[in-house]
Interface confidence: low
């Protein structure tokens, strides 16, 4: 009679994470008598996966009934596969011995590869806000996928970005992999509503890529433009001066009025109006009693936006003559930078 052979017909098996792997093994003879064991890996460090004779292996079931006398099918199923299960599995026939069974013959081995989905991409932006025209970096990370082949794309508002660098780790063989990508994005004043999207495509995702997003509203700072204008007089000796703070983001803003360098009033932006592009406008006004000043008055609107160094705009108020009525120009209509003396 021909000597027993252990046949593992599958060189490799590819299974999705969470599914069941079937590892096939057939013996060509019933002789010699003895149990079958399954191992992952070869050599002294191999890991016992299943022992026909004894032990408890909750994730492993046999394909056929190994208690039947004439059974020669030693295939097993391993449930709830994870990337950690990847490796080469050997079906090994033992010959009954005393006191211990002796290894008789091994199958050629079946390589189990696990297809694992990448984790949802996490996109993170810079720690500090940046202003328009500056280039900022965004990172995207996804982990735990297998096989290694993966595609990552960056988009800004649906437009694909080209300035990015991607690494997949580790470089060598591994049970699972991670991807890390850094994209450079140039900010514009219109980016408050913009989104940066990292898209990951992998064989396990069946054509539905995973996406991670970052809102540029978390990243951008649009500094305000200031305009100080003088409004028509309210009374014989009172002048109303407005400071228009336009197109700023985020909302955090503090405004201080200075009269000849002395603090007159400080206030925080509250009832702002929002522009279509997501930036804000705000207006503050100061009622100046001209009769209280003997000399010309320098009015300064000083704005501290989002913790940045203050910016200011000044307006000279001459008190040497009575103020004239201005035209019908309202603050909203006066779009130029009006620093003219109107006396």
């Amino acid at each position: 009679e021909e000597e027993l052979q252990v046949i593992q017909p599958d060189k490799s098996v590819l299974v999705a994470a969470g599914e069941t792997a079937t590892l096939r093994c057939t013996a060509t003879s019933l002789i010699p008598v003895g149990p079958i064991q399954w191992f992952r890996g070869a050599g002294p460090g191999r890991e016992l996966i299943y022992n026909q004779k004894e032990g408890h292996f909750p994730r492993v079931t046999t394909v056929s009934d190994l208690t039947k006398r004439n059974n020669m099918d030693f295939s097993i199923r391993i449930g709830n596969i994870t990337p950690a299960d990847a490796g080469t599995y050997y079906c090994v026939k033992f010959r009954k011995g005393s006191p211990d069974d002796v290894e008789f013959k091994s199958g050629a081995g079946t390589e189990l590869s696990v297809r694992a989905k990448p984790s949802a991409p996490v996109v993170s932006g810079p720690a500090a806000r940046a202003t328009p025209q500056h280039t900022v970096s965004f990172t995207c990370e996804s982990h735990g996928f297998s096989p290694r082949d993966i595609t990552l794309k960056w988009f800004k508002n649906g437009n694909e970005l080209s300035d990015f660098q991607t690494n997949v780790d580790p470089v060598g063989e591994s049970v699972s992999y991670s991807i890390h990508s850094t994209a450079k994005v140039v900010l514009t004043r219109e980016d408050v509503h913009s989104q940066v999207i990292c898209e990951v495509a992998h064989v396990t995702l069946q054509g539905d890529p995973l996406r991670g997003t970052a809102n540029l509203s978390e990243t951008i700072r649009v500094p305000p433009t200031l305009e100080v204008t003088q409004q028509p007089v309210r009374a014989e000796n009172q002048v109303n001066v407005t400071c228009q703070v336009r197109k700023f983001y985020p909302q955090r803003l503090q405004l201080t009025w200075l009269e000849n360098g002395n603090v007159s009033r400080t206030e925080t932006a509250s009832t702002v109006t929002e522009n279509k592009d997501g930036t804000y406008n705000w207006m503050s006004w100061l009622l100046v009693n001209v009769s209280a000043h003997r000399d010309d008055v320098k009015l300064t609107c000083q704005v501290e936006h989002d913790g940045q160094p203050a910016v200011s705009k000044s307006h000279d108020l001459k008190v040497s003559a009575h103020p004239k009525e201005q035209g019908s120009n309202t603050a909203a209509e006066n779009t130029g930078s009006n620093e003219r003396n109107i006396y």
Partner: antibody, heavy 119, light 103 residues
Framework: DVQLVESGGGVVRPGESLRLSCEAS????????MTWVRQAPGEGLEWVST????????YYADSVKGRFTISRDNSKNSLYLQMNSLRADDTAIYYC????????????WGLGTLVTVSS | ALTQPASVSANLGGTVEITCSGG????YGWYQQKSPGSAPVTLI????NRPSNIPSRFSGSTSGSTTTLTITGVQAEDEAVYYC?????????FGAGTTLTVL
């Protein structure tokens, strides 16, 4: 770069056999389904056969079922098509194609090999 | 079977749409063949995915059982036969091909 190179084409008589090969490089061959597509002279593309990544499942067009056998050797990064009982209407250029996720989509194609069946 | 028009024409720089319908595919692909016997080139796979070497003027969309290949800014080199592909009860199928003529 992904490359698929077919070979094994030639002129045979009706009823004879031929074995086509496709050598793959530039990607992890064992992770992808592979397909044979053919194009008869003056005709459109016709799907012939597909094999799963592990090689344990094969699909065939009705026109070749029982005559053609698709196989692969992942250790050699190679795909094969054993064609038996060849007929005149099997005359075509045979392309090897790499499938992408679902086996009915192909993202890379070989240049093809011509099979002529003529008496 | 997948049904697509036998031929379409487009002006240089214009936009052209080629539709494909039928079969019971959930997803489709589009393939370009510039001359009979030359290797097909994948333009779109799985409805909307474009290989990295394919220009962005080619795009795909699918609604129900109809898939559409759109070429915006048609170039002279786009003159070719375009095949749609899908699956039907386990079999791979192709449309008969649409010849694009650039005017």
């Amino acid at each position: 770069d992904v490359q698929l190179v077919e070979s094994g084409g030639g002129v045979v008589r009706p009823g004879e056999s031929l074995r086509l090969s496709c050598e793959a490089s530039g990607f992890t061959f064992r992770n992808y389904y592979m397909t044979w597509v053919r194009q008869a002279p003056g005709e459109g593309l016709e799907w012939v056969s597909t094999i799963s990544d592990t090689g344990d499942t094969a699909y065939y067009a009705d026109s070749v079922k029982g005559r053609f056998t698709i196989s692969r050797d992942n250790s050699k990064n190679s795909l094969y098509l054993q064609m038996n009982s060849l007929r005149a209407d099997d005359t075509a250029i045979y392309y090897c194609a790499k499938s992408w996720i679902w086996w009915t989509f192909f993202d890379y194609w070989g240049l093809g090999t011509l099979v002529t069946v003529s008496s | 079977a997948l049904t697509q028009p036998a031929s379409v024409s487009a002006n240089l720089g214009g936009t052209v749409e080629i539709t494909c319908s039928g079969g019971n595919s959930n997803h489709y692909g589009w393939y370009q063949q510039k001359s009979p016997g030359s290797a097909p080139v994948t333009l779109i796979y799985a409805d909307t995915n474009r290989p990295s070497n394919i220009p962005s003027r080619f795009s795909g969309s699918t609604s129900g059982s109809t898939t559409t290949l759109t070429i915006t800014g048609v170039q002279a080199e786009d003159e070719a036969v375009y095949y749609c592909g899908g699956s039907s009860t386990g079999d791979g199928i192709f449309g008969a091909g649409t010849t694009l003529t650039v005017l």
